[in-house]
C-alpha cells in the first residue's frame, strides 16, 4: 500500500463564520519539514503555500480575501514532506454571513425562565429563506437547524443552568450563505434543584477550537534539547 503521512488539522482562525467582503484565514497544521501545503475547495486545488524555512514551522495560514458566497463551502488541506503526501484533512465548512437581511429572535416563555421549564426560540426572517440556524455564544459549532417559510422554532427540553447564555439566529440561503445575525437573546435560567454554583457557564471568549496553533521550532528549543542531552551524559 502507498505510504502517506498523517492527516493535517484544518482550522478557521477566530471563526468559520465570515462576514461578506471580509478576509477569512484558514490554518493547516501539518508537521515540521513540510515543504508544501495545498488548500482544496470543494475537492479542487484552491491555493498553495510553501513555508520558509520548512523545518522550522508546523503549518501555514491561507488568507482568503473578500469573502463571498462563491468562496463559501467545504475546505480541506494536505501537505508534502519531500515526495511524500499526507492524507487529506477533515473537511471544514466555511460560511459567509451578513448576506441580505437580519432575522429577529424571540424566546418563549421569555428570556428569564426557571429550571425545568420548556423553552422555544423563534427565529423570523421575512425574506425568502427556508433554513434557520440557532447558535449559542461560545458554542458556535453546536448549530441547531430548523425549517420554515418565514420563521422557525427551536424547542428545547426542560432547561437547566447549562442553557444559560446568549443566543443568536441566522436565516440561511444555502448551507454556506447565512444572513446577518439576529440581535442576541440572553437566556437566564434560575432555580436549579442541584447546586447552581457547579453549573457550567459560557466562555465569553471565542470558541477555543477556532484558534490557529502553529508553532515555530526556535533555536532556543534546539539549545534546550542539546543541554538536556549533555546533562544526561554528565549524570551517567
Amino acid at each position: 500500500p502507498k505510504q502517506t503521512l498523517p492527516k493535517p488539522i484544518i482550522r478557521a482562525e477566530s471563526t468559520y463564520m465570515v462576514p461578506k467582503e471580509k478576509q477569512a484565514t484558514l490554518c493547516c497544521q501539518g508537521s515540521y519539514g513540510a515543504v508544501e501545503y495545498q488548500l482544496h475547495f470543494e475537492g479542487s486545488l484552491f491555493a498553495v503555500e510553501r513555508p520558509k524555512p520548512p523545518e522550522r514551522i508546523n503549518g501555514v495560514k491561507f488568507h482568503i480575501p473578500d469573502m463571498n458566497s462563491r468562496k463559501a463551502g467545504r475546505y480541506s488541506c494536505i501537505y508534502r514532506v519531500g515526495e511524500l503526501w499526507s492524507e487529506r484533512s477533515d473537511l471544514l465548512d466555511l460560511v459567509v454571513t451578513e448576506m441580505y437581511d437580519t432575522p429577529t429572535l424571540s424566546v418563549h416563555p421569555g428570556p428569564e425562565v426557571t429550571s425545568g421549564e420548556k423553552v422555544t426560540f423563534y427565529c423570523r426572517l421575512d425574506t425568502a429563506t427556508s433554513m434557520f440556524l440557532l447558535l449559542k455564544e461560545g458554542r458556535s459549532r453546536d448549530v441547531q437547524r430548523s425549517y420554515g417559510k418565514v420563521q422557525a422554532e427551536f424547542p428545547m427540553g426542560p432547561v437547566t443552568t447549562a442553557h444559560r447564555g446568549s443566543y443568536r439566529c441566522f436565516g440561511s440561503y444555502n448551507n454556506y450563505a447565512w444572513s446577518f445575525p439576529s440581535e442576541p437573546v440572553k437566556l437566564l435560567v434560575t432555580g436549579d434543584i442541584e447546586n447552581t454554583s457547579l453549573a457550567p457557564t459560557d466562555p465569553t471568549f471565542p470558541d477555543s477550537w477556532d484558534t490557529c496553533l502553529l508553532t515555530r521550532e526556535t533555536g532556543l528549543q534546539k539549545d534546550l534539547a542539546l543541554w538536556d542531552h549533555t546533562a544526561q551524559n554528565l549524570l551517567r
Epitope: 418563549h108 416563555p109 421569555g110 425545568g116 421549564e117 420548556k118 427565529c123 420563521q151 426542560p158
Partner: antibody, heavy 115, light 107 residues
Framework: QVQLQQPGAELVKPGASVKLSCKAS????????MHWVKQRPGQGLEWIGM????????NYNEKFKSKATLTVDKSSSTAYMQLSSLTSEDSAVYYC????????WGQGTTLTVSS | DIQMTQSPSSLSASLGERVSLTCRAS??????LNWLQQEPDGTIKRLIY???SLDSGVPKRFSGSRSGSDYSLTISSLESEDFVDYYC?????????FGSGTKLEIK
C-alpha cells in the same frame, strides 16, 4: 399597574369578519408575547395563538389557523385578532393575555354572531 | 397535542378545609404549568406559574407541586372567595392546552 383593555362586546353578522382589540399598558409591550384564548358559554378555555410584538413571530393552534389572524400595532401597544367567515360557533368570550406564561389577562370581549 | 386531564370536575368543601386539585399531562411538560382562577364574572387571574411559583399578591394558602406527570394545586385553608373555577394550563408545547376546569363549591 399592568392592564389589558378589551371592548366588552361585539355583535356581528354570520359570514362577516371582526377585528378584536387588546390595548396594553403598564409594561413594555414589545418585549412580551400576547396570547388569545376562546371560551364558549359554559365551556372551558381554548388557546388560539400568540404573537411577539417585537419580532412579529406567531404561533397558532392548528385548529384556528384559517379562522384567526394575529397582528400588533406597536405604536399604540395594541394587539389585534381578526376572525373571518364568522358562524354561530364563533360566538364566545375572547380573552387576550400578556406575557409568555399568560401572566396577565384582559376582561374578555363577548362576541355574538347573529343575523 | 398534549392532553391535560383535570380532576375533580367539581368539588364541594367547607370553609377552612384543605383541598387539592390535580392535572395530569399526557406528555412531558417539564415545569411549564400554570394554575388559573376564574371568577363568575369571567375575570381570569393566574395564581401559580412554572408549577410552583406563586404570583405576587396571591395569598400564601395557595401552593403548587408536581409528582411525575401529576401537577397539583393545594389550598391549605379555604376562604369564601376561593369558591370559583380553577384551570391548569400547559405552556410547554404548542398548542398550549388547558385542563377542563374544576368548580369549587361551598358545602
Amino acid at each position: 399597574q399592568v392592564q389589558l383593555q378589551q371592548p366588552g362586546a361585539e355583535l356581528v353578522k354570520p359570514g362577516a369578519s371582526v377585528k378584536l382589540s387588546c390595548k396594553a399598558s403598564g409594561f413594555t409591550f414589545t418585549n412580551y408575547w400576547m396570547h388569545w384564548v376562546k371560551q364558549r358559554p359554559g365551556q372551558g378555555l381554548e388557546w388560539i395563538g400568540m404573537i411577539h410584538p417585537n419580532s412579529g413571530s406567531t404561533n397558532y393552534n392548528e385548529k384556528f389557523k384559517s379562522k384567526a389572524t394575529l397582528t400588533v400595532d406597536k405604536s399604540s401597544s395594541t394587539a389585534y385578532m381578526q376572525l373571518s367567515s364568522l358562524t354561530s360557533e364563533d360566538s364566545a368570550v375572547y380573552y387576550c393575555a400578556g406575557g409568555g406564561r399568560l401572566d396577565y389577562w384582559g376582561q374578555g370581549t363577548t362576541l355574538t354572531v347573529s343575523s | 397535542d398534549i392532553q391535560m386531564t383535570q380532576s375533580p370536575s367539581s368539588l364541594s368543601a367547607s370553609l377552612g378545609e384543605r383541598v387539592s386539585l390535580t392535572c395530569r399531562a399526557s406528555q412531558d411538560i417539564g415545569s411549564s404549568l400554570n394554575w388559573l382562577q376564574q371568577e363568575p364574572d369571567g375575570t381570569i387571574k393566574r395564581l401559580i406559574y412554572a408549577t410552583s411559583s406563586l404570583d405576587s399578591g396571591v395569598p400564601k394558602r395557595f401552593s403548587g407541586s408536581r409528582s411525575g406527570s401529576d401537577y397539583s394545586l393545594t389550598i391549605s385553608s379555604l376562604e369564601s372567595e376561593d369558591f370559583v373555577d380553577y384551570y391548569c394550563l400547559q405552556y410547554a408545547s404548542s398548542p398550549f392546552t388547558f385542563g377542563s376546569g374544576t368548580k369549587l363549591e361551598i358545602k
